[in-house]
Interface confidence: low
């Protein structure tokens, strides 16, 4: 993994120990960012639909990437856009939704082993020569002596989930991205009530593990909209 590189571009499958949001694909643009109350775990989304401005992918929500809203548009104006689903056109991994990556300009399903191998090879080749093309486009990266060739353990800095060991995903923690555990059955997950109702989170939870989906907890159906608890449940 790249244990010395923080806040990468192109990380999907993201997100917190505290509040946070694992966004939902489908929105055209992001809403204003979520707010985490310092020191607590109350999380609040501002429910207006202003496009969230960004400089790069790290500043967007889980299932978003940073780009100009108009095709070939003004490079100076970028906002968070919804990730692209399988078989959609892409220019870099960040544009593809969780579980996919950009190959030959198309979002394809991640065969994790193949993808991880590809990432590892790229890192190995670039070690020491200050060049890396992990995001599908050239990006200079200094790889310090802290770069290990084993998969990132929990807490290791990562570029994307494929940098993390099995059972972990790459998720935002403050101003960096680290490997965090994929959620297990019964664990609290974050699902937004409305498409596009998320933006930047200080923290992010991982997604639910294989065979699980983030759904409202049965005994919380009657609860108020703001307090409904979502957990990872069997399909």
């Amino acid at each position: 993994t790249l244990n010395s590189v923080l806040n990468s571009n192109a990380i999907k499958n993201l997100p917190p120990p505290l509040g946070g949001a694992a966004g939902h694909p489908g929105s055209a643009v992001s809403a204003a960012p979520g707010i985490l109350y310092p020191g607590g775990n109350k999380y609040q989304t501002i429910d207006n639909y202003q496009p969230y401005p960004c400089a790069e992918d790290e500043e967007c929500g889980t299932d978003e990437y940073c780009a100009s809203p108009t095709r070939g548009g003004d490079a100076g104006v970028q906002i968070c856009l919804a990730c692209r689903k399988r078989r959609k056109r892409c220019m870099r991994h960040a544009m593809c939704c969780p579980g996919n990556y950009c190959k030959n300009g198309i979002c394809v399903s991640s065969d994790q082993n193949h993808f991880r191998g590809e990432i590892e090879e790229t890192i190995t080749e670039s070690f020491g020569n200050d060049h890396s093309t992990l995001d599908g486009y050239s990006r200079r990266t200094t790889l310090s002596s802290k770069m290990y060739h084993t998969k990132g353990q929990e807490g290791s800095v990562c570029l994307r989930s494929s940098d993390c060991a099995s059972g972990l995903c790459c998720a935002r923690h403050f101003w960096s991205k680290i490997c965090k555990p994929v959620l297990k059955e019964g664990q609290v997950c974050t699902k937004h009530r409305r498409k596009g109702s998320h933006g930047l989170e200080i923290f992010q939870r991982c997604y639910c593990g294989e065979g699980l989906s983030c759904r409202i907890q049965k005994d919380h159906h009657q609860a108020s909209n703001s307090s409904r608890l979502h957990t990872c449940q069997r399909h």
Epitope: V5, P38, G39, A55, G155, H173
Partner: antibody, heavy 118, light 107 residues
Framework: EVQLLESGGGLVQPGGSLRLSCAAS????????MTWVRQAPGKGLEWVSA????????YYADSVKGRFTISRDNSKNTLYLQMNSLRAEDTAVYYC???????????WGQGTLVTVSS | DIQMTQSPSSLSASVGDRVTITCRAS??????LNWYQQKPGKAPKLLIY???SLESGVPSRFSGSGSGTDFTLTISSLQPEDFATYYC?????????FGGGTKVEIK
Amino acid sequence: EVQLLESGGGLVQPGGSLRLSCAASGFTFRSYGMTWVRQAPGKGLEWVSAISRSGGNTYYADSVKGRFTISRDNSKNTLYLQMNSLRAEDTAVYYCARTYSYGSFDYWGQGTLVTVSS
Amino acid sequence: DIQMTQSPSSLSASVGDRVTITCRASQNIKTYLNWYQQKPGKAPKLLIYGASSLESGVPSRFSGSGSGTDFTLTISSLQPEDFATYYCLQTYSVPLTFGGGTKVEIK
């Protein structure tokens, strides 16, 4: 070799302003979140502020919120801390540091002393 | 805010001693706990991150353990260069908070 070099400290009157700089070298500056930590004379460490690698996200301690502004210029490999409405309790050595795993700070500058006194 | 309570605030020890410093968080911080060493007039130095991961270049006599609210920094055999002040830092919740420090002095 990774190096962080702070500058801009000095003596300033209460209510005054200072701008600290932290020049980074030996690593790809724009690939790292950065932070400011301070230490009052004879006291412990206090986290002040942090910024994401693009500068899009900033974080502040309550004690400086609304008075201090963290920023960075990735083209110049430099981190900044604009300090306004300075108070006597802001007197401290200010360190810039690079963020690593678990939000830890793996490389630190040597520090620059800010003295707020009339 | 999460309070970090470090103890003891100071201790006297001899070269070769086993030294243990503890840090208690006011709420569960999982393993988002780092340890630093600081010598007079110098910047802090990262020793341990993620509660137990040894920073590269740090001697193996330093070790960290704990999770949740209780954490420990252990120096298995104190060396002359280890006399310094040690701080813990939680990075689980903004604002990040340091412990008050433990000064390790020569007995």
